[in-house]
């Protein structure tokens, strides 16, 4: 999906009002400097691409983020403020239902959410170019 035409300010507002708190709640108990920041993004569409990938694509050691509160709110924000996004996700969602596993917070998931916090932080930068 091409995130170029999203309403970035509305997505930012959704992040600041709720998603950020849910990420904080998920990370509760984690040491500040436990994880190195290794994932980056250069502009807002790129940030959203990386955010979507880390949030919804299962990775080795972390298959369970998509059902977390922050993930569901991220999905809702993208569906509302990115034209055509929800249509592209129908097949992905059906595939995800087949893979659905019980919720387990692994260290790998915590590391992944730490990277997500960094990506969201970059997305929110006021001077970050949109294209």
């Amino acid at each position: 999906y091409d995130f170029t035409n999203c309403d970035f300010e509305k997505i930012k507002a959704a992040y600041l009002s709720t998603i950020s708190k849910d990420l904080i709640t998920y990370m509760s108990g984690t040491k500040s400097t436990e994880f190195n920041n290794t994932v980056s993004c250069s502009n807002r569409p790129h940030c959203l691409t990386e955010i979507q990938s880390l949030t919804f694509n299962p990775t080795a050691g972390c298959a369970s983020l998509a059902k977390e509160m922050f993930a569901m709110k991220t999905k809702a924000a993208l569906a509302i403020w990115c034209p055509g996004y929800s249509e592209t996700q129908i097949n992905a969602t059906q595939a995800m239902k087949k893979r659905r596993k019980r919720k387990v917070t692994t260290n790998k998931c915590l590391e992944q959410v730490s990277q997500l916090q960094g990506l969201w932080r970059r997305f929110n930068r006021p001077l970050l170019k949109q294209q």
Epitope: K21, I24, T25, K31, S32, T33, E34, T38, S40
Partner: antibody
Framework: QVQLVQSGAEVKKPGASVKVSCKAS????????MHWVRQAPGQGLEWMGE????????DYNQNFRGRVTLTVDMSTSTVYMELSSLRSEDTAVYYC???????????WGQGTLVTVSS | DIQLTQSPSFLSASVGDRVTITCKAS??????VAWYQQKPGKAPKLLIY???MRHTGVPSRFSGSGSGTEFTLTISSLQPEDFATYFC?????????FGQGTKLEIK
């Protein structure tokens, strides 16, 4: 182990600028954020701003925006805090402090006293 | 910005006493609160993070609790080295803010 070593005390006249350094060691410099916090004599702690050494992006406390500038020298793993248009109420100890993506401060510099006096 | 109000501002106590310091936030900060101890002429030292987690090397007599808008730091049995100033800090929302401090003095 992580170490943050700050430059020495400064005495400045009102209206002048001051530049305080914070040299980091013991970790990957670009992996974490560096913050600055100040404390006026007998007062509480006030967060001033942060810099991401990986790309020099800064965020400032609205109270200081326009007067404070954070910069980084990658070659020496040093962060600088410059405060301009100094006034007597800027007399304080200035600390650098380190965080990851979660913003509580588990590592601090030793502090730099800046005195603004005519 | 989120305001943090600490109480009391000053506290006199004796060695062996149990003391509690309160920090109230102007809005919900989940459990994103840290506590620091500061001695004269020194940088603050992290005691507690995530409202209740003790930092490495912090004695077990220090404990934290709370969530939402009300948080407490408790020292179960004061030791001579505990007389210092204590600050709470919230990291739930930008800009990061501190309480005004509680100075703990020997009675």
């Amino acid at each position: 182990q992580v170490q943050l070593v700050q430059s020495g005390a400064e005495v400045k006249k009102p209206g002048a600028s001051v530049k305080v350094s914070c040299k980091a060691s013991g970790y990957t410099f670009t992996s974490y954020l560096m913050h600055w916090v100040r404390q006026a004599p007998g007062q509480g702690l006030e967060w001033m701003g942060e810099i991401d050494p990986s790309d020099s992006y800064t965020d400032y406390n609205q109270n200081f925006r326009g007067r404070v500038t954070l910069t980084v020298d990658m070659s020496t793993s040093t962060v600088y805090m410059e405060l301009s248009s100094l006034r007597s109420e800027d007399t304080a100890v200035y600390y650098c402090a380190l965080t990851g993506t979660i913003n509580y401060f588990d590592y601090w510099g030793q502090g730099t006293l800046v005195t603004v006096s005519s | 910005d989120i305001q943090l109000t600490q109480s009391p501002s000053f506290l006199s106590a004796s060695v062996g006493d149990r003391v509690t310091i309160t920090c109230k936030a102007s809005q919900d900060v989940v459990t994103a609160v840290a506590w620091y101890q500061q001695k004269p002429g020194k940088a603050p030292k992290l005691l507690i993070y995530w409202a209740s987690m003790r930092h490495t090397g912090v004695p077990s007599r220090f404990s934290g609790s709370g969530s939402g808008t009300e948080f407490t730091l408790t020292i179960s049995s004061l030791q001579p080295e505990d007389f210092a100033t204590y600050f709470c800090q919230q990291y739930s929302s930008f800009t990061f803010t501190f309480g005004q401090g509680t100075k703990l003095e020997i009675k």
